[in-house]
């Protein structure tokens, strides 16, 4: 039994790290393999993860970690019974993939402005709580080419956009993801999307002027 692609891990920097690897051939990951991990510290428990299959030869393991600090380092040992297949280490702070933002809501009743809000997925005592910035993806449900990304480079989990920038009488969807620049993280997964109907109508004067102008051509 051989490891074809060594484990690579990412951490949400609160409680969960996910490691993935590929074996040399079809493997029943949960029956044949164990990933043992331990924090390099004075008082730390040895933990064991039972991997799941990710395709015929791929394995994935969810490592539970608690109270992470920036300097944390874990030893990782991949076992097949009594045989040590691979030995490595993992520093969560250097491989951060934030949790996805939660509770994305779109408010359409704020005059001619769309207000999108979501919640930071971290509690206030976590380092990432004050470090996340966001990207919001808005797209037209009926036209895949009508899609845009808004970079939210401030920390407030809100975005205001003019309803007039979107097509009137169309259903739109939005989703949001996060990253932590200071920890050189990857982007989080996208949040679940939320849907709304853009009922914005152009003001009469503008509409009338537009129509008149058109008539002369």
């Amino acid at each position: 039994m051989k490891v074809l692609q060594e484990p690579t891990c990412v951490s949400d920097y609160i409680s969960l790290s996910t490691c993935e690897w590929k074996m040399g051939g079809p493997t029943n990951c949960s029956a044949e393999l164990r990933l043992v991990y331990q924090l390099v510290f004075l008082i730390s428990e040895t933990n064991m993860c039972v991997p799941e299959n990710n395709g015929a030869a791929g394995c994935v393991c969810h490592l539970f970690m608690e109270d992470m600090v920036g300097a944390d380092n874990y030893t990782l040992d991949l076992w097949a019974g009594q045989q040590l297949l691979w030995k490595g280490s993992f520093k969560p702070s250097e491989h951060v993939k934030p949790k996805a933002p939660e509770n994305l809501t779109v408010y359409t009743n704020v005059s001619e402005t769309l207000l999108l809000t979501w919640s930071n997925p971290y509690p206030p005592d976590n380092y990432l709580y004050e470090k996340l910035t966001y990207a919001v993806n808005i797209w037209n449900e009926n036209d895949p080419t009508d899609s845009r990304i808004y970079d939210v480079t401030y920390q407030e989990p809100t975005l205001r956009i003019a309803a007039s920038t979107l097509k009137s009488g169309v259903s739109y969807r939005a989703r949001v993801r996060a990253w932590a620049q200071s920890y050189n993280s990857t982007w989080s997964e996208w949040s679940p999307s939320t849907k709304w109907y853009n009922a914005y109508k152009e003001p009469f004067e503008k509409h009338h002027h537009h129509h008149h102008h058109h008539h002369h051509h």
């Epitope: 409680s15 608690e66 600090v69």
Partner: antibody, heavy 116, light 112 residues
Framework: EVQLVQSGAEVKKPGATVKISCKVS????????MHWVKQAPGKGLEWVGR????????IYASKFQGKATITADTSSNTAYMELSSLRSEDTAVYHC?????????WGQGTLVTVSS | DIVMTQTPLSLSVTPGQPASISCRSS???????????LEWYLQKPGQSPQLLIY???NRFSGVPDRFSGSGSGTDFTLKISRVEAEDVGVYYC?????????FGQGTKLEIK
């Protein structure tokens, strides 16, 4: 052997500032959160705040926001707490404690007395 | 803030007899990672506190097995199966799940 050795007792006048230290041996402070806990004379324990020495990220109990400032020097493996605008109610023993992820190691405490 | 309420506030026990201290939190102390960071500390006279129990039920290394922790949700209990003279001091429960972290007001254990 793990030791958290705190600086000696301090007597300060109201309005003054005091900075107390907690020198750690036996482990690297970057590997834990360093917390401070207050114990007023004859009273119970009160959590003040904590620091992640790796990145300097601090968090405080709201009543100590603006009162306490926690810092850490990883090169000397020492945590500090500064208390400003001292008043008589700040008179207490202050303990430094490492938490990973529970309070396993405590300093011996530093008595700060505020008296005119 | 989460308030941790201990009962009783004082306890006088004959050596060899059991003792029980209750700790109630004003709201759930389950952390977002699923753990319950409920701990028990003993502060012996003239000493710094020492850890007895972590995560509700786990005895810290070197703690005698006469100490046990139990509970869930908002109600937690520390039991000493047979009190010994060295157990005197003030016992504190503590929640480390939600900032600001909070201690109970303490329970003083004396020997009869």
């Amino acid at each position: 052997e793990v030791q958290l050795v705190q600086s000696g007792a301090e007597v300060k006048k109201p309005g003054a500032t005091v900075k107390i230290s907690c020198k750690v041996s036996g482990f690297n402070i970057k590997d834990t959160y360093m917390h401070w806990v207050k114990q007023a004379p004859g009273k119970g324990l009160e959590w003040v705040g904590r620091i992640d020495p790796t990145n300097g990220y601090t968090i405080y109990a709201s009543k100590f926001q603006g009162k306490a400032t926690i810092t850490a020097d990883t090169s000397s493996n020492t945590a500090y707490m500064e208390l400003s605008s001292l008043r008589s109610e700040d008179t207490a023993v202050y303990h430094c404690v490492s938490r990973r992820p529970w309070f396993a190691y405590w300093g011996q405490g530093t008595l700060v007395t505020v008296s005119s | 803030d989460i308030v941790m309420t201990q009962t009783p506030l004082s306890l006088s026990v004959t050596p060899g007899q059991p003792a029980s201290i209750s700790c109630r939190s004003s709201q759930s102390i389950v952390h977002s990672n699923g753990n319950t960071y409920l701990e028990w500390y003993l502060q012996k006279p003239g000493q710094s506190p020492q850890l007895l129990i972590y995560k509700v039920t786990n005895r810290f290394s070197g703690v005698p097995d006469r100490f046990s922790g139990s509970g869930s949700g908002t109600d937690f209990t520390l039991k000493i199966s047979r009190v010994e003279a060295e157990d005197v001091g003030v016992y504190y429960c503590f929640q480390g799940s939600h900032v600001p972290y909070t201690f109970g007001q303490g329970t003083k254990l004396e020997i009869k």
